[in-house]
């Protein structure tokens, strides 16, 4: 999915209302030193291709995060404000259901949340002049 | 707990260059970004740029564009802002400042570092 | 550069009672506007940010509103602790840009 025409303030709005919270409860108890954040974006249809990457893909150690509250609002978010987007996504939303583990917070899930919240605030701010 | 800590007061000369440094401890230095805000005596807040720590990436205001580098080193989780070409009116105390959770502000300072230009 | 107008610029306040500062950007700035708080001889400190989001630790007598242009920072009840200048700030577009302060004394 093309990120490009999506209504990045209303996204962006969604997320500090709400989704930066959930991101905080569900990290609640790491040290802020822990994780390092190795994934980057440089501009805000990147940003949102990465957040739905490491949101919604179930990674290697890390199945279950589609199912937490920030995901769910996340997913919310993109479809009410990305034109089009509900519609590319029910194939990966039939396929994940298919998928469907119990919900298990590892050590590798905290370390994504921390990505994603680094993702987060480069979609917030993002550092080129481009805005 | 969060910190930045800043380097002390300099005295310069006009034309020359200083190099002030902000070392932060308490989190992960390369996930935030720091930002540089400066204040003249009785002044308000004027903001010279900001760099990411993670990549160096920076983004200057115009108005330093030229005279002000920011660096940081990772290995030490040191932020560095360098001004050159000082003249009288760069007289003011410069702040290190860390963005926010969200990306949206500017959650803790550091102490500030005065520098005052004078021949 | 977008210009970030406050006023008053200085007020002063009885303890108890309410205070407000407005402050206008020279274009829209969505709601990308944080409010920070100088006490005499330190460092500022965060207050709201994302309009009317508050800080951790700040305490609910502070409040944010606005949109677009036209932003206002109220205190509800005015402390003696609450004395300082207050800046209103936009990143909404480089470079980031402050206003010029509002002095709050106590009367």
């Known amino acids: 999915y093309d990120f490009t025409n999506c209504d990045f303030e209303k996204i962006k709005a969604a997320y500090l209302s709400t989704i930066s919270k959930d991101l905080i409860t569900y990290m609640s108890g790491t040290k802020s030193t822990e994780f390092n954040n190795t994934v980057s974006c440089s501009n805000r249809p990147h940003c949102l291709t990465e957040i739905q990457s490491l949101t919604f893909n179930p990674t290697a150690g890390c199945a279950s995060l589609a199912k937490e509250m920030f995901a769910m609002k996340t997913k919310a978010a993109l479809a009410i404000w990305c034109p089009g987007y509900s519609e590319t996504q029910i194939n990966a939303t039939q396929a994940m259901k298919k998928r469907r583990k119990r919900k298990v917070t590892t050590n590798k899930c905290l370390e994504q949340v921390s990505q994603l919240q680094g993702l987060w605030r480069r979609f917030n701010r993002p550092l080129l002049k481009q805005q | 707990e969060v910190q930045l800590v800043q380097s002390g007061a300099e005295v310069k000369k006009p034309g020359s260059s200083v190099k002030v440094s902000c070392k932060a401890s308490g989190y992960a230095f390369s996930n935030y970004l720091i930002e540089w805000v400066r204040q003249a005596p009785g002044q308000g807040l004027e903001w010279i740029g900001v760099i990411d720590p993670g990549n160096g990436d920076t983004n200057y205001n115009e108005n330093f564009k030229g005279r002000a580098t920011l660096t940081a080193d990772k290995s030490t989780s040191t932020a560095y802002m360098e001004l050159s070409s000082l003249r009288s009116e760069d007289t003011a105390v410069y702040y290190c400042a860390r963005e926010d959770n969200t990306g949206t502000a500017f959650d803790y300072w550091g102490q500030g570092t005065t520098v005052t230009v004078s021949s | 550069s977008i210009v970030m107008t406050q006023t008053p610029l200085s007020l002063s306040v009885t303890p108890g009672q309410p205070a407000s500062i407005s402050c206008k950007a020279s274009?829209?700035?969505?709601?990308?506007v944080t409010w920070y708080l100088q006490k005499p001889g330190q460092s500022p400190q965060l207050l709201i940010y994302y309009v009317s989001n508050h800080y951790t630790g700040v305490p609910d007598r502070f409040s944010g509103s606005g949109s677009g242009t036209d932003f206002t920072l109220k205190i509800s009840r005015v402390e003696a602790e609450d004395v300082g200048v207050y800046y209103c700030?936009?990143?909404?577009?480089?470079?980031?840009?402050f206003g010029q302060g509002t002095k709050l004394e106590i009367k």
């Open positions: 700030q936009q990143h909404h577009r480089f470079p980031l840009t």
């Open positions: 274009q829209s700035v969505s709601s990308d």
